[in-house]
Amino acid sequence: MMTGTIETTGNISAEKGGSIILQCHLSSTTAQVTQVNWEQQDQLLAICNADLGWHISPSFKDRVAPGPGLGLTLQSLTVNDTGEYFCIYHTYPDGTYTGRIFLEVLESSVAEHGARFQIP
């Protein structure tokens, strides 16, 4: 029985050229997190493996920084970075939990963070 929930930063916006932190947090379960995959529309950005640590995809080495924690920092944002991002928590014994974040990269200097929300 999967009892956990993933809390994410929800819908967020950021300025072109700036940085943003993508964060997910798994709660309400004692399952062990074995690996977290960060994806952007089916493309793998990075992996944080419990035994092997952080690994960044060749597509994103120059623009992605690990952390904080199990989160991911996107740098040098472009308008093309607008879209859905997913944190996929692989856990034992529960299985897989997925959180969704929507990032909008704005041309203007007005970029407000959205509210947090939960995905069961």
Partner: antibody
């Protein structure tokens, strides 16, 4: 000892689809420490990486932008192999096509090519 | 794309002499996060696929003779064959696996003088 055995046609007509298969022995296509690539070589383009498939708790693909609109690389876990499909072939796609294992050592998402298939000369001609 | 440029295009060296092949990348292939250099060297003989010689710029692949060595940092790399043997006649390629698309140098043809 890892071995990669390629199969598929050597002649393809223009506008048709190239289908090649790479059978793996001595490793698993679902390995968490490898990725499975297709690379081609021609006198005009040299060695050109086309794309890869790999499993890291789920399946992923990465493709070269130059062929992204017409390439598909699929794993077949039941046969322990992976395939290349390249659509809309033109004479410029004439090349020797290789499959290769990318060993993920120290970095589980990138590595060098430590095992290669024997190569398949593919000619695109009517 | 990262462009890999090798020099020279061809090289003739006497048996037993040192052979040096250079490779330059258009941008750094050193990843600061893990301090690894994402560069490999391959040897290709006629009618055969490339064979891995060196990875992480300087680590020799298992079974590769110790006369082959790799060095370099950032954007400039060298493959050295300390004492050329007849079986070393081949085309040599460098390759970066830092970012997509993975790219290769144009090759250096090594012959015996």
């Amino acid at each position: 000892q890892v071995q990669l055995q390629q199969s598929g046609p050597g002649l393809v007509k223009p506008s048709q689809t190239l289908s090649l298969t790479c059978a793996i022995s001595g490793d698993s296509v679902s390995s968490n420490s490898a990725a499975w690539n297709w690379i081609r070589q021609s006198p005009s383009r040299g060695l050109e990486w086309l794309g890869r498939t790999y499993f890291r708790s789920k399946w992923y693909n990465d493709y070269a932008v130059s062929v992204k609109s017409r390439i598909t690389i699929n794993p077949d876990t039941s046969k322990n192999q992976f395939s290349l499909q390249l659509n809309s072939m033109t004479p410029e796609d004439t090349a020797v096509y290789y499959c290769a294992r990318e060993r993920a050592l120290y970095d589980i998402l990138a590595g060098s090519f430590d095992y290669w298939g024997q190569g398949t000369l593919v000619t695109v001609s009517s | 794309d990262i462009v890999m440029t090798q020099s020279p295009d061809s090289l003739a060296v006497s048996l037993g002499e040192r052979a040096t092949i250079n490779c330059k990348s258009s941008q750094s292939v050193l990843f600061g996060f893990n301090n690894k250099i994402y560069l490999a060297w391959y040897q290709q003989k006629p009618g055969q696929p490339p064979e891995l010689l060196i990875y992480w710029a300087s680590t020799r692949e298992s079974g590769v003779p110790d006369r082959f060595s790799g060095s370099g940092s950032g954007t400039d790399f060298t493959l050295t064959i300390s004492s050329l043997q007849a079986e070393d006649v081949a085309v040599y390629y460098c390759q970066q696996y830092y970012s997509f698309p993975y790219t290769f140098g144009q090759g250096t043809k090594l012959e015996i003088k």
